[in-house]
């Protein structure tokens, strides 16, 4: 029988009646085109739904939009199209929702060809009212909010102008022309690249990187010969063209571009790329593409300055064509990442790291699972996870892996069990310990979502036929109940729940199709009566993360500390609630060699914790760029992993001596940088 459908599964009492009383249908009174949905604010219950219907005419596309608003998590919707004067809203810009709980919304309208500029509709009261504003430019990008102040907006125009508003889009000012890419940094700083001669494409590799910290009053050129730039955590990265050839290198700054250091990463050629896979305030995962159209590259992990890098994973799958990578941050457990590698035989295999890229391993085979046809040995194989790449290849995978920070340890993903990813129909697997162990949760592909911080998991079968059944589990996917939410099946298009997994409401979206018409319909189910009571102390149990061997004194130590969590017991059917905060208790570990990365010029042989010198560098002085000077590194091969909190124990020493020589980099040194004022 399918997992969780045997007789001995714990049943939730009278759930059909409880859910029937809390199922709300809404039929949308318009033609079936496309629908987009946005949550406005956190825990407000406000949802905006924009439906658009395109009629392609010979000369132009005529379109019609409708805007709906719910303030009860989708149980009821009100047509508020009149608030935007029945204007056609451009779906490619979506709905720009303000950060945090600002209640701000910007909709970008489609305007007729001859107009001087675009048009936006602005709301700062959670979409209760909108103000129409005509723009002095045609927007090329969605309005971008400053993370620090939601009244500050920036946008690029179709003519490559950089426009800024200081009063939430009421008034706009063009602060710079010839801009290719612009991003908000911290403290309302704007970084942007600009071209001098031709265009963004023509000047690629000859762009300048500029910064303004006062919304365009004054500027500072912080880089030249720029190909591209990116922000990650506290790091500012720029890929810079080399003087002599067409290669480029990564430079990094941790002071908003005032000083730069050359990252110790391989340079890349014209057809190659760099990609920041993940970054936080401690470190960064960087992908460096291999030469040629291989579809793979190498993952490197940085030190705390983003300068010295360790090779983390070879043959990392990252397609050049579609730009697809399976790299996934498992947000439900610290230090865990999952990705795919392209093996020598061109099969794709899943790898997991539990220590922020220090070591990668295959995923453990789920208990009670058979190895599939891809396995050479029927008793030894691994779980392989379907993510972005499988979705892009149109495999039968409706969803990427899912994890939530407040649903500790839970990871849900489609997968297959064998020696590599299989093209056969996948099943859904769950881990309750952050990826160490897995069990088959559901047979066949499903859509899934986490509610109430893991207290409920909801799933809907992925099918080409109309559906009317939803499945739910109150014990982290062990046992499943099915609920028929409508008599008349619908063509399912998506599951929607409030981001953050704290809600107990789920909306099922789809359309009904009869001979004459087709209409959008949503069913919102509130699970509050299934979880009748609030969870109490007795409903939680203590769990040690990353535990692999209780007999090891340092069991659970990852990045220098271990964490114990209070987790909901699987048998407890109760509400964590909106205010649920993960209770955890850290304790510091003794340092071991595992707490250190190999320094520049060193590497770890497989299955060894010691760092040894790279043969090609033996006996050479190790010199590298730091803040525009050449440095001499005296090392015994180790450096502390960024974010590692261990104390005592093993303590390999590392020191850097300043050689006071200039670096041979064409990048700007501080004295070459200049400032300008508007």
């Amino acid at each position: 029988s399918a997992p969780g459908e045997d007789e001995e599964c714990g049943r939730v009492r009278d759930f059909v009646a409880k859910l029937a009383n809390n199922t709300h249908q809404h039929v949308f009174d318009d033609l079936r085109g496309s629908v987009s949905l946005s949550w406005v604010g956190d825990s407000t219950g406000v949802i905006l739904v924009l439906t658009t219907f395109h009629v392609p005419l010979v000369i132009m596309t005529f379109g019609q939009s409708k805007l709906y608003r719910s303030e009860d998590y989708g149980k009821n919707f009100k047509d508020i199209t009149d608030l935007i004067n029945n204007t056609f809203i451009r779906t490619e810009f979506g709905m720009a929702i303000g950060p945090e709980n600002s209640g701000k919304v910007v909709l970008t309208a489609e305007v007729s060809g001859g107009s001087r500029g675009g048009r936006i509709f602005r709301s700062s009261d959670f979409a209760k009212n909108f103000v129409q504003t005509d723009l002095p430019f045609h927007p090329l990008t969605q309005m971008m909010y400053s993370p620090q102040n939601s009244d500050y907006l920036l946008a690029l125009s179709t003519e490559n102008g950089l426009w800024v508003s200081k009063n939430f889009g009421g008034k706009w000012e063009e602060i710079h022309k010839a801009v290719c890419l612009a991003k908000w940094g911290s403290d309302n700083t704007i970084f942007f690249t600009t071209y001098a001669n031709g265009s963004c494409k023509a000047d690629l590799g000859a762009l300048e990187l500029w910064r303004t910290s006062d919304l365009g009053k004054s500027f500072k050129t912080i880089g030249v010969k720029i190909y591209s730039f990116g922000l990650g955590g506290r790091f500012l990265f720029a890929s810079v063209m080399a003087d002599k050839d067409t290669t480029r290198r990564i430079h990094v700054s941790t002071d908003q571009g005032d000083t730069w250091s050359m990252a110790q990463l391989p340079s890349v050629g014209q057809e190659q790329f760099y990609s920041i896979l993940a970054a936080n305030d401690d470190m960064v995962f960087m992908h460096v593409d291999e030469p040629g159209d291989t579809g793979f590259g190498t993952i490197f992990t940085s030190d705390d300055r983003g300068i010295v890098y360790s090779k983390s994973l070879d043959r990392h799958l990252y397609t050049t064509t579609g730009g697809e990578t399976d790299f996934t941050n498992v947000t439900s457990l610290r230090g865990v990442y999952i990705t795919s590698v392209l093996s020598e035989d061109n099969s794709i295999q899943t790898m997991i790291t539990f220590d922020q890229g220090g070591r990668w391993t295959h995923l453990r085979k789920p208990e009670n699972s058979e190895c599939d046809a891809t396995a050479k040995n029927k008793n030894e194989c691994s779980l392989h996870i379907h993510a972005s790449y499988s979705i892009s290849q149109k495999l039968n995978v409706p969803m990427a892996p899912l994890s939530e920070p407040n649903a500790v340890g839970i990871v849900i993903a489609h997968g297959s069990v064998g020696d590599a990813i299989s093209v056969m129909v996948p099943d859904v697997y769950i881990s309750d310990d952050g990826g160490y162990s897995w069990t088959k949760m559901l047979e066949g592909p499903h859509y899934y979502t986490i509610l109430d911080s893991g207290g409920i998991i909801v799933a809907i079968e992925h099918s080409s036929r109309p559906i009317n059944v939803i499945k739910f589990s109150t014990d982290e996917g062990q046992c499943w109940q099915t609920y028929t939410f409508t008599r008349d099946p619908i063509y399912f298009t998506g599951l929607a729940s409030e981001p953050g997994a704290r809600s107990m409401n789920i909306s099922i979206w789809g359309f009904t199709e009869s001979f004459a018409t087709s209409q959008w319909v949503s069913y919102t189910i509130d699970f509050k009566d299934i979880l009748e009571r609030n969870c109490e102390e007795k409903d939680y149990t203590i769990w040690l993360a990353h535990s692999t061997d209780p007999e090891d004194y340092e069991d659970g130590c990852i990045l220098g500390y271990k964490e114990q969590f209070l987790r909901l017991r699987k048998s407890s059917v109760c509400q964590n609630g909106r205010d649920y905060v993960v209770t955890k208790q850290p304790s510091i570990c003794l340092c071991s060699l595992e707490d250190f990365l190999c320094d520049f010029g060193y590497y770890r042989p497989e299955n060894d914790s010691k760092c040894v010198e790279q043969p090609e560098l033996k006996g050479h002085d190790l010199e590298f760029c730091l803040y525009g000077r050449e440095e001499h590194l005296t090392t015994n091969g180790y450096r502390k992993i960024p974010g590692d909190k261990c104390q005592g124990g093993v303590n390999p020493v590392r020191e850097v001596k300043d050689l006071k020589k200039k670096c041979t980099s064409n990048f700007l040194s501080p004295e070459k940088q200049n400032s300008k004022s508007n």
Epitope: G10, I542, A545, S547, D555, K562, S571, Q585, S587
Partner: antibody, heavy 124, light 106 residues
Framework: QVQLVQSGAEVKKPGSSVKVSCKAS????????ISWVRQAPGQGLEWMGG????????NYAQKFQGRVTITADESTSTAYMELSSLRSEDTAVYYC?????????????????WGQGTTVTVSS | DIQMTQSPSTLSASVGDRVTITCRAS??????LAWYQQKPGKAPKLLIY???SLESGVPSRFSGSGSGTEFTLTISSLQPDDFATYYC????????FGGGTKVEIK
């Protein structure tokens, strides 16, 4: 081989308190929960509560809440159970037991190592 | 708290018999159940954890099964050393024990 050695028998007056110790040797004390279980003469087993030495997280059965205090001293690999406001019904053999552990969960895998038991007699 | 009901409370059997003891939980506890053997004047001994996993050093004649609310301990062929009291214990709520089953000589 892990061993749990408990303190000796106690005779107590009603209303007083008793503190029983349980010293672990030969294993990683800090990584396992220690439970306290009692057994009245001729009766079954009754769980009182447990503690995880790392962090000192203690939890108690509802019946004993407010009357029992379980503590642990990592430096000496010793767990303690103190029961206050003693009455004659508290006369029993008190066992400490290590909770076996195969994963990160401390209490799910049964009690694989037991102390020899401490007899506590409450009598006026 | 979760209640554990064990049956029978007493069981008379002979050496070589197949013996079955059942334990019912008041709500689903998944597979989080352990079985113990206790002899007079001695501490209990763990036989089975996670409903069906045999503790190391325990003879293979002991086996456990079940999940959810219904569980069984089976002794395939009763040996003289097996006459004792057996307890089930759930671990998915605050720990609770069953009332015990005394296996005595017929």
């Amino acid at each position: 081989q892990v061993q749990l050695v408990q303190s000796g028998a106690e005779v107590k007056k009603p209303g007083s308190s008793v503190k029983v110790s349980c010293k672990a040797s030969g294993g990683t004390f800090r990584n396992y929960a220690i439970s306290w279980v009692r057994q009245a003469p001729g009766q079954g087993l009754e769980w009182m509560g447990g503690i995880i030495p790392i962090g000192g997280w203690a939890n108690y059965a509802q019946k004993f809440q407010g009357r029992v205090t379980i503590t642990a001293d990592e430096s000496t690999s010793t767990a303690y159970m103190e029961l206050s406001s003693l009455r004659s019904e508290d006369t029993a053999v008190y066992y400490c037991a290590r909770q076996g552990r195969k994963t990160g969960y401390y209490y799910y895998y049964g009690m694989d190592v037991w102390g020899q038991g401490t007899t506590v007699t409450v009598s006026s | 708290d979760i209640q554990m009901t064990q049956s029978p409370s007493t069981l008379s059997a002979s050496v070589g018999d197949r013996v079955t003891i059942t334990c019912r939980a008041s709500q689903s506890i998944s597979s989080w159940l352990a079985w113990y053997q206790q002899k007079p004047g001695k501490a209990p001994k763990l036989l089975i954890y996670k409903a069906s996993s045999l503790e190391s050093g325990v003879p293979s004649r002991f086996s456990g099964s079940g999940s959810g609310t219904e569980f069984t301990l089976t002794i395939s062929s009763l040996q003289p050393d097996d006459f004792a009291t057996y307890y089930c214990q759930q671990a998915d709520g605050h720990i609770t024990f069953g009332g015990g089953t005394k296996v005595e000589i017929k």
